[in-house]
C-alpha cells in the first residue's frame, strides 16, 4: 500500500495505490483511491508511467481527456467514471502487455488540493494448475498442468503424508512455449505416488504462486486449486 500526500500551496490530499500484477493478454486493474470531492467537475485524474512521454490516461470535468495520451495506451484504458465521485481513480487496462510493467503515478487534483502516489505494476502470465491421475503411465503417476506462465516458474511437489520430503528425484517438469512465443505451458509429472495421500503441485514465479491439490483414495479423487498474486503492497 502506498499512501502519497500532495505537497502544495493549495492543500494536500491523500492518494492511495496498491501494487498489483497484470496477466498478459487479459484486462488488469491499477488501483487508486483518493479523498473524494463534492463536485465531479472539480476532479482531475491523471495516470502517468515512468519514462513515457504521453499520459496513460486523463479524466477531467467528468469525462476522459485523451488528447495527450501516449500511443502505447491508445484504446486500452478506462476509469470507472461512475465511481470517481466517491474517490475511486482506479484504471482498467485492457489487453495487458509485457511492456506495461513499470512504475505508475496516480495524480489527483480536486478543489481540496492535489496529491499523488506511485504504484509498481508487474506483468507476466499465471494460471491455475490442474492435477490429474495419469492412467496412461506404467506406475501410479500424477500430472500437473498449467496452460500459461511467464516468466518461467519453479515447480515443487509436496505431500501431506511425507511432509518436508524432496520429490525432485521422482518428478519431471517441462515447459512448452505457447503459440504467441511468450507464455509457456507447464507440465510436471510425479511418479511413485501412493493412495490415501494428498499431493500438492506448487507453481511460482515472481508474480504469482499457484497450487493444485489432489487427494487420491481408493474410492474417490478430490481436487482443489488456488492462485495468489505476490507483492500486492499498498502505497
Amino acid at each position: 500500500l502506498i499512501i502519497g500526500f500532495g505537497i502544495s500551496g493549495r492543500h494536500s490530499i491523500t492518494v492511495t495505490t496498491v501494487a498489483s500484477a497484470g496477466n498478459i493478454g487479459e484486462d488488469g486493474i491499477l488501483s487508486c483511491t483518493f479523498e473524494p470531492d463534492i463536485k465531479l467537475s472539480d476532479i482531475v485524474i491523471q495516470w502517468l508511467k515512468e519514462g513515457v512521454l504521453g499520459l496513460v490516461h486523463e479524466f477531467k470535468e467528468g469525462k476522459d481527456e485523451l488528447s495527450e495520451q501516449d500511443e502505447m495506451f491508445r484504446g486500452r484504458t478506462a476509469v470507472f467514471a461512475d465511481q470517481v465521485i466517491v474517490g475511486n481513480a482506479s484504471l482498467r487496462l485492457k489487453n495487458v502487455q509485457l511492456t506495461d510493467a513499470g512504475t505508475y503515478k496516480c495524480y489527483i487534483i480536486t478543489s481540496k488540493g492535489k496529491g499523488n502516489a506511485n504504484l509498481e505494476y508487474k506483468t507476466g502470465a499465471f494460471s491455475m494448475p490442474e492435477v490429474n491421475v495419469d492412467y496412461n503411465a506404467s506406475s501410479e503417476t500424477l500430472r500437473c498442468e498449467a496452460p500459461r506462465w511467464f516468466p518461467q516458474p519453479t515447480v515443487v511437489w509436496a505431500s501431506q503424508v511425507d511432509q518436508g520430503a524432496n520429490f525432485s528425484e521422482v518428478s519431471n517438469t517441462s515447459f512448452e512455449l505457447n503459440s504467441e512465443n511468450v507464455t509457456m505451458k507447464v507440465v510436471s509429472v510425479l511418479y511413485n505416488v501412493t493412495i490415501n495421500n494428498t499431493y500438492s503441485c506448487m507453481i511460482e514465479n515472481d508474480i504469482a504462486k499457484a497450487t493444485g491439490d489432489i487427494k487420491v483414495t481408493e474410492s474417490e479423487i478430490k481436487r482443489r486449486s488456488h492462485l495468489q498474486l505476490l507483492n500486492s503492497k499498498a502505497s
Partner: antibody, heavy 120, light 107 residues
C-alpha cells in the same frame, strides 16, 4: 552518484553534421524519458527534443524537426542527438536532462553541457 | 505553442529581502510548471516542480505557487548564493517551453 555527461560538441560549418552523446550513470536509465535542451550564448533555455524510456516515442521542437534525430542505447546507458543541416542559429550549449514522470517532476538531473558552434 | 512570460527580466535586491518572480502562461497549464536556477557557466538546477513542490535538498526559502495561467516564485530571504538567473518551464504539453529568465542580483 547520479550523473549525465555530454560530449561530441565542437565547431562545424553551416550545413554540416554532428552527433552529441550523453552518458548516464548512477540510475536506471531506461526508467527515464530523456531530453535535450539548448542555450544560445547569452540567451535563455530552449527545449529541443525528448525520447521515452524505451526509445519508442520521440518529440521535437519545430525549429529542429526534420534535421535533428534523438535516439538512445539503453544497453550502453547513452542518449544521442544526431544534428544534420546545421545552421548558425543552432550554435548553443546543449544539455541533456532526465525526466521520470511527464508533467509533474521536471528535469531533476542535467549534464554539464557541450558547446556546438556553427560557423564558416 | 504555449508562451511563458516571466517578469521582471532582471531585479536587484538586498540580502534578506523577499524576492518575487511571476510567470504567466498563454493558456491554462494546470499545475504543470517547474522553476530552475542557473548560475553563470553552470547547468540549470531544478528548484520547484509541479508549481509548488520543493525539490529534495533545496532550501525552504524557495517556494512556488499558482495554477492555471499565473504562477509565482518566491525567495523569502535572499542570500548571496542566490545570485543567478531563474527560469519557469511549462510541462503541460509539447513543445515544452521556458520563460525568458529573470536575472537576480544583489544590491
Amino acid at each position: 552518484e547520479v550523473q549525465l555527461v555530454e560530449s561530441g560538441g565542437g565547431l562545424v560549418q553551416p550545413g554540416g553534421s554532428l552527433r552529441l552523446s550523453c552518458a548516464a550513470s548512477g540510475f536506471t536509465f531506461n526508467s527515464y524519458a530523456m531530453h535535450w535542451v539548448r542555450q544560445a550564448p547569452g540567451k535563455g533555455l530552449e527545449w529541443v527534443s525528448a525520447i521515452s524510456g524505451n526509445g519508442g516515442s520521440t518529440r521535437y521542437a519545430d525549429s529542429v524537426k526534420g534535421r535533428f534525430t534523438i535516439s538512445r542505447d539503453n544497453s550502453k546507458n547513452t542518449l544521442y542527438l544526431q544534428m544534420n543541416s546545421l545552421r548558425a542559429e543552432d550554435t548553443a550549449v546543449y544539455y541533456c536532462a532526465r525526466d521520470r514522470f511527464r508533467k509533474v517532476h521536471g528535469f531533476d538531473v542535467w549534464g554539464q553541457g557541450t558547446l556546438v558552434t556553427v560557423s564558416s | 505553442d504555449i508562451q511563458m512570460t516571466q517578469s521582471p527580466s532582471s531585479l536587484s535586491a538586498s540580502v534578506g529581502d523577499r524576492v518575487t518572480i511571476t510567470c504567466q502562461a498563454s493558456q491554462d497549464i494546470s499545475n504543470y510548471l517547474n522553476w530552475y536556477q542557473q548560475k553563470p557557466g553552470k547547468a540549470p538546477k531544478l528548484l520547484i516542480y509541479d508549481a509548488s513542490n520543493l525539490e529534495t535538498g533545496v532550501p525552504s526559502r524557495f517556494s512556488g505557487s499558482g495554477s492555471g495561467t499565473d504562477f509565482t516564485f518566491t525567495i523569502s530571504s535572499l542570500q548571496p548564493e542566490d545570485i543567478a538567473t531563474y527560469y519557469c518551464q511549462q510541462d503541460a504539453t509539447f513543445p515544452l517551453t521556458f520563460g525568458q529568465g529573470t536575472k537576480v542580483e544583489i544590491k
